[in-house]
């Protein structure tokens, strides 16, 4: 059997939250993009087919003021086919930092998603095909951008779930309701940024299957903050 | 509204320089590639240069070498440093901005500066 993931703080993950340096990283980040697709061709072309797909759902889209589109590019292309490789080089960014290619992309949706917050929180359902551990100790949190769905039914499908894997249950009130921007709105998608962190994590296998309750959710502060921006910022934090 | 706003421009000796300047307001500047056209009597107008929002460069091959084109994101304006002028290079230059996007092939909207005369004496 596979080895099980650990549920922990994510301690390798890229984190920025861009605070206090939007204005700045919004005049910089169309350059860190075009250095990504330079290193990157899979974004290249992930965010060439978005930016049409965009185009075409753009104006049946409810937005909020600031929201431009190169974030609504940024969401889109996240849908697609980019989740699996950017998640990755975002959880283990700290182990080679050099080879991180998604410095405007993790920008503009991170920034997506901050934009479209609307301060409610809401109990999602995320189903994986791979097993979580809790240690019992400590907060948590994911350290990745992370799809989860308002109804159970679709995080416990058979594109998401099986019976090794996790179902999640959160209480989330950072993740956003991103069915709009969706290439799949039925999946009614709710993307989670990986800084949320949860306080309160059970664990129980009643059903058959592993579950995981993540509640009291919170957004602290991260360990990186406005990295890419020159005037970079890294504090290490100890979250437990 | 969006708009553009030329300056610079005016009558120069040939193998002299000059800069023209175009600040566009009204739009979220960054994401917006920006072109600069001329038109010469007589002529049909030609795209000279053009900058992607990534900063990738484009040249008529009739400038390349002496014109740089560059933006300014904190500014929110393109530049056009014209080197080693040329009487051909006498026209009515005018600043584009095209749709948002990271292509780097530029594609014209409707959104034109009012145009700036450069007349190059030999």
């Known amino acids: 059997l596979a080895v099980p993931f650990m549920l922990d703080m994510a301690p390798n993950a890229f984190d920025d939250q861009y605070e206090s340096c939007v204005e700045d990283m919004e005049k910089k980040a169309p350059q860190l993009l075009q250095e990504d697709f330079n290193m990157n061709e899979e974004l290249k072309l992930e965010w060439e087919k978005a930016e049409i797909n965009w185009k075409e759902i753009k104006n049946s889209t409810s937005y909020p003021a600031g929201f431009h589109d190169f974030h609504g590019t940024a969401l889109v292309a996240y849908t697609g086919n980019l989740a699996i490789d950017f998640n990755r080089a975002v959880r283990d960014f700290k182990k080679s930092p050099d080879n991180f290619h998604y410095k405007a992309f993790h920008y503009y949706l991170t920034r997506a998603v901050q934009l479209l917050n609307d301060q409610g929180c809401s109990l999602v359902y995320r189903g994986t095909k791979v097993m979580f551990e809790y240690t019992g100790k400590g907060s948590v949190r994911f350290g990745q951008f992370s799809s989860s769905s308002l109804t159970k039914r679709v995080a416990l499908s058979s594109n998401f779930f099986s019976n090794h894997g996790t179902l999640f249950i959160i209480r989330t009130c950072l993740g956003v309701n991103i069915k709009e921007f969706s290439s799949f709105p039925r999946e009614e998608e709710v993307l989670i940024p990986g800084y949320e962190v949860y306080h309160k994590v059970t664990a129980q296998n009643d059903n058959g299957y592993n579950e995981i309750f993540l509640d009291s959710p919170e957004r602290k502060k991260s360990n990186f903050n406005c990295f890419y921006n020159g005037s970079a910022q890294t504090v290490n934090i100890d979250f437990s | 509204q969006v708009q553009l706003q030329q300056s610079g421009g005016g009558l120069v000796q040939a193998g002299g320089s000059l800069t023209l300047s175009c600040r566009v307001s009204?739009?979220?500047?960054?994401?917006?590639?920006l072109a600069w056209y001329r038109q010469a009597p007589g002529k049909e107008r030609e795209l000279v240069a053009s900058i992607s929002a990534g900063h990738v460069t484009n040249y008529n091959v009739a400038v390349e070498g002496r014109f740089i084109i560059s933006r300014d994101n904190y500014k929110d304006t393109v530049y056009l440093k014209m080197n080693n002028v040329k009487p051909e290079d006498t026209a009515v230059y005018l600043c584009?901005?095209?749709?948002?996007?990271?292509?780097?092939?530029?594609?014209?909207?409707?959104?034109w500066g009012q145009g700036t005369q450069v007349t190059v004496s030999s």
């Open positions: 009204g739009t979220h500047f960054p994401i917006r590639p």
């Open positions: 584009n901005l095209g749709p948002a996007t990271m292509s780097t092939d530029f594609r014209p909207t409707d959104f």
